[in-house]
């Protein structure tokens, strides 16, 4: 009876269970009734990080110096290269595909601390009574306009992204 499922680190092919290639190796040929799975080590600047049946290894990530990237950890046959940014610069994402001098705080957030050479911008949500309608790396949340001090009334409530809208008071005749 041919198997319908295989053990861990095996795969099913031609009604038989073959061993997967270990991390750092790629598949050259499937096993047969008489031979084991044939695997080959990944070449220089290539890797595979799982037990696999891949016929091609993945290229190591390139840390492009033109994007401000440098190698944080050199890749091996089993691991990809890890990039980081030049000193004083900050990754735009966890994958660190490019670098920015500092990130900005989106509308609804204000700058709590301006970036330094070692730390990125720290943002904070605008609390009730404050707003920010811009992306900025230096602007704090601004207080809502006080309509009362201008002898006006609130026509439209403020949010964390918008100021209040003031208007004239209804005069009773």
């Amino acid at each position: 009876e041919p198997p319908t499922a295989c053990r861990e680190k095996q795969y099913l092919i031609n009604s038989q269970c073959c061993s997967l290639c270990q991390p750092g190796q790629k598949l050259v040929s499937d096993c047969t009734e008489f031979t084991e799975t044939e695997c080959l080590p990944c070449g220089e600047s290539e890797f595979l990080d799982t037990w696999n049946r891949e016929t091609h290894c993945h290229q190591h990530k390139y840390c492009d110096p033109n994007l401000g990237l440098r190698v944080q950890q050199k890749g091996t046959s089993e691991t990809d290269t890890i990039c980081t940014c030049e000193e004083g610069w900050h990754c735009t994402s966890e994958a660190c595909e490019s670098c920015v001098l500092h990130r900005s705080c989106s509308p609804g957030f204000g700058v709590k601390q301006i970036a330094t050479g070692v730390s990125d911008t720290i943002c904070e949500p605008c609390p009730v009574g404050f707003f920010s309608n811009v992306s900025s790396a230096f602007e704090k949340c601004h207080p809502w306009t006080s309509c009362e001090t201008k002898d006006l009334v609130v026509q439209q409530a403020g949010t964390n992204k918008t100021d209040v809208v003031c208007g004239p008071q209804d005069r009773l005749r």
């Epitope: 033109n66 994007l67 401000g68 940014c85 030049e86 610069w89 735009t92 490019s98 670098c99 920015v100 001098l101 500092h102 990130r103 900005s104 811009v134 992306s135 900025s136 790396a137 230096f138 602007e139």
Partner: nanobody
């Protein structure tokens, strides 16, 4: 493609003044917060000054407060930094920066040397 071209640097004596300019192209200048940053020899980048898109709000590092003035002319797509009472510690390459300041967006910078 974003292009930022800084100019106006040079050699100046302590106490002197310089005005830096940054000509911007490849993006809608009036929509962006702009920064001046500098890099002294052998040091990291220091954020010097910033200005909001309308030119109504500014930021200055403590080290330049009261001496430097940032401004912009949105009709000319140009950013300025007026530097007065210059000190030896202001010696650096000055770069203008668009937010977000990508490494790949850097201009060549302009060198300011303050020395007697």
């Amino acid at each position: 493609e974003v292009q930022l071209l800084e100019s106006g640097g040079g050699l100046v004596q302590p106490g002197g003044s310089l005005r830096l300019s940054c000509a911007a192209s490849g993006f809608t200048f009036r929509d962006y917060e702009m920064w001046w940053v500098r890099q002294a020899p052998g040091k990291g980048l220091e954020r010097v000054s910033a200005i909001n898109p309308q030119g109504t709000r500014t930021y200055y590092a403590d080290s330049v407060k009261g001496r430097f003035t940032i401004s912009r002319d949105n009709s000319k797509n140009t950013l300025y930094l007026q530097m007065n009472s210059l000190r030896a510690e202001d010696t650096a390459v000055y770069y203008c920066a668009k937010l977000p300041f990508r490494f790949s967006d850097r201009g060549q910078g302009t060198l300011v040397t303050v020395s007697s």
